[in-house]
């Protein structure tokens, strides 16, 4: 039995920050679980890990330098990412593993979310307007 995961197909990170909600076909309440977010088609980069243990405080970390936080819902984990760079535009996949109680469960690979990181554009000064548009 596999947990199903739903994610938004695409998100735009304005101000170099984004919230990505991973919705599961499984209630995480009173479970020990490890939710993670992975970057790239091959999910090679583990962006963020959220470890939950029986409704206690979530433990959040990244082995790859991403600034992240997590929030738990009954059937969801939302990953909050800050200080993203334009070159981190990519597809991101939610993963979930339930360690306790048995049996161990994980998810079917989701369709992923394309996160498009928009660069910060400075508004042109009124004294020096940008090129006029036709």
């Amino acid at each position: 039995n596999k947990i199903l995961v739903k994610q938004s197909p695409m998100l735009v990170a304005y101000d170099n920050a984004v919230n990505l909600s991973c919705k599961y076909s499984y209630n995480l309440f009173s479970r020990e679980f490890r939710a993670s977010l992975h970057k790239g088609l091959d999910s090679a980069v583990e962006v963020c890990v959220v470890y939950g243990n029986y409704s206690q405080q979530l433990q959040v970390y990244s082995k790859t330098g991403f600034n992240c936080d997590g929030k738990l819902g009954n059937e969801s984990v939302t990953f909050y990412l800050q200080n993203l760079y334009v070159n981190q535009t990519d597809i991101y996949f939610c993963k979930i593993e339930v360690m306790y109680p048995p049996p161990y469960l994980d998810n079917e690979k989701s369709n992923g979310t394309i996160i498009h990181v928009k660069g910060k554009h400075l508004c042109p000064s009124p004294l020096f307007p940008g090129p006029s548009k036709p």
Epitope: Q59, V60, F66, N67
Partner: antibody
Framework: EVQLVESGGGLVQPGGSLRLSCAAS????????IHWVRQTPGKGLVWVSR????????SHADSVRGRFTISRHNAKNTLYLQMNSLRAEDTAVYYC?????????????WGQGTLVTVSS | EIVLTQSPATLSLSPGERATLSCRAS??????LAWYQQKPGQAPRLLIY???NRATGIPARFSGSGSGTDFTLTISSLEPEDFAVYYC?????????FGQGTKVEIK
Amino acid sequence: EVQLVESGGGLVQPGGSLRLSCAASGFTFSSYWIHWVRQTPGKGLVWVSRINSDGSSASHADSVRGRFTISRHNAKNTLYLQMNSLRAEDTAVYYCTRSDSSTWYKFDYWGQGTLVTVSS
Amino acid sequence: EIVLTQSPATLSLSPGERATLSCRASQSVSSYLAWYQQKPGQAPRLLIYDASNRATGIPARFSGSGSGTDFTLTISSLEPEDFAVYYCQQRSNWPPTFGQGTKVEIK
């Protein structure tokens, strides 16, 4: 006036435990992330742990993960750091500091620090 | 994790002189860099955040510049109370890290 006041430091033997507290005043405590940063003469300033504004999530540096636990009591405007399995290298001055919940690691106010000495 | 290297380790100057402190990151931190001042027996105090923004109550003689990997803190004219240790800190990548500090001492 924003104030953060640490307490609970002292001398403890290796393998022992200690609980630090940080009492906050002068701002809306429940709106801020709170952190512990430690300072040693050898390693300088090192970020240790953080807790988000409602206490639902936390992060720890690799060097303390599994040994230290950060928590907060928003009704009491107080932050805690439970330190277990202490090692000599945990000897430091421990500061609590805050950051806005929109700029997670910009430390705009700091307490005066409390000294933890781990020695036999 | 990102390593921040500050130079020089010590800067010996007289009141009224200009101080230029450097902080170099092991990889780009964009503009997510802060500067702190610490006096003996006191906690660090935020001076500059996001490379060039002065924190609340910080005098105009303190200014920050740079982006990417190279940053500078400038004190345009040293006052007696400015003699202290200065640290840079990045929040671009997790975990946040600090430089080892530059001591500005009276010549």
